[in-house]
């Protein structure tokens, strides 16, 4: 169940977000989330994950990019980018994904 909290060993992560008590936190994994709200600059938040590990597998979009890692302070120097908005091409692309 992805909503259940992880009870494994905890890792120390860099914490830089409006939800941090201090500069580090302890969690099941470390996170970096880059979010762009409509009409605003993107904001990058670092912290700890304990629930919803499925978010780590999400693909980047033009609005959010979610990164997870599992080692000590592994989220400290990670920088994310958002998926660029692609204008519709005039002809179908031929390169497979």
């Amino acid at each position: 169940d992805p909503v259940k909290p992880s009870r494994g060993p905890l890792v120390t992560c860099t914490c830089e977000s409006p939800h941090c008590k201090g500069p580090t936190c302890r969690g099941a994994w470390c996170t970096v989330v880059l979010v762009r709200e409509e009409g605003r600059h993107p904001q990058e938040h670092r912290g700890c994950g304990n629930l919803h590990r499925e978010l780590c597998r999400g693909r980047p979009t033009e609005f959010v990019n979610h990164y997870c890692c599992d080692s000590h302070l592994c989220n400290h120097n990670v920088s994310l980018v958002l998926e660029a908005t692609q204008p519709p091409s005039e002809q179908p692309g031929t390169d497979g994904q």
């Epitope: 909290p5 830089e16 977000s17 409006p18 939800h19 941090c20 304990n50 629930l51």
Partner: antibody, heavy 113, light 110 residues
């Protein structure tokens, strides 16, 4: 859009009880720690209690520990504060807050005989 | 008496820069992040600064925060009449295992 809507406030006699609720919407409620903060009329902000994402960890200000109980129901996206043995000095606006950014508009609790 | 100490009042004229101080101890400001909230009359507090000096999306860059040791400050430049409000600092306190607030500073724009 993040929204927090408190309810359950009102007039209560000293020694009485109230249960406050905070309905959350616009975000994944189960991913965030939550708090209750209160503000007596004309006074400053006072932290009451907080609860972690799954409800397994709770912290209280000393003066309210034992009388107040914080809880949450993630399936209903709702935060609660059970307040017992209320005193006149508990009269305040009680705010529900997502730690540590968004706040609701508050619900007024008045304790008087 | 609040755990974090703030001046009860501050004032300035439009366009001026004003600074509000917040003093704590090693168990709160000294080891944890400082937050600043603005409370306009009759409304709920709004987050202005988190993580000592970071602004949430939508907060004007006229507002800035800083921290040194066990003290912090909020600076407001280019003061406007709509900045008239109560301002609160806050931090987590490791000794109390809870959130602590300053007593609030009432800012008047003259």
């Amino acid at each position: 859009e993040v929204q927090l809507l408190e309810s359950g406030g009102g007039l209560v006699q000293p020694g009485g009880s109230l249960r406050l609720s905070c309905a959350a919407s616009g975000f994944t409620f189960s991913s965030y720690a939550m708090s209750w903060v209160r503000q007596a009329p004309g006074k400053g902000l006072e932290w009451v209690a907080n609860i972690n994402q799954d409800g397994s960890e709770k912290n209280y200000v000393d003066s309210m520990r034992g009388r107040f109980t914080i809880s949450r129901d993630n399936s209903k996206n709702t935060l609660y504060l059970q307040m017992n043995s209320l005193r006149a000095e508990d009269t305040a606006v009680y705010y529900c807050a997502r730690e540590f950014d968004y706040w609701g508009q508050g619900t007024l609790v008045t304790v008087t005989s | 008496q609040s755990v974090l100490a703030q001046p009860p009042s501050a004032s300035g004229t439009p366009g001026q820069r004003v600074t509000i101080s917040c003093s704590g101890s090693s168990s709160n400001i000294g080891s944890n992040y400082v937050y600043w909230y603005q409370q306009l009359p009759g409304t709920a507090p709004k987050l202005l600064i988190y993580g000592n000096n970071k602004r949430p999306s939508g907060v004007p860059d006229r507002f800035s925060g800083s921290k040194s040791g066990t003290s912090a400050s909020l600076a407001i430049s280019g003061l406007r009449s709509e900045d008239e409000a109560d301002y609160y600092c806050a931090a987590w306190d490791d000794s109390l295992n809870g959130r602590v607030f300053g007593g609030g500073t009432k800012l008047t724009v003259l």
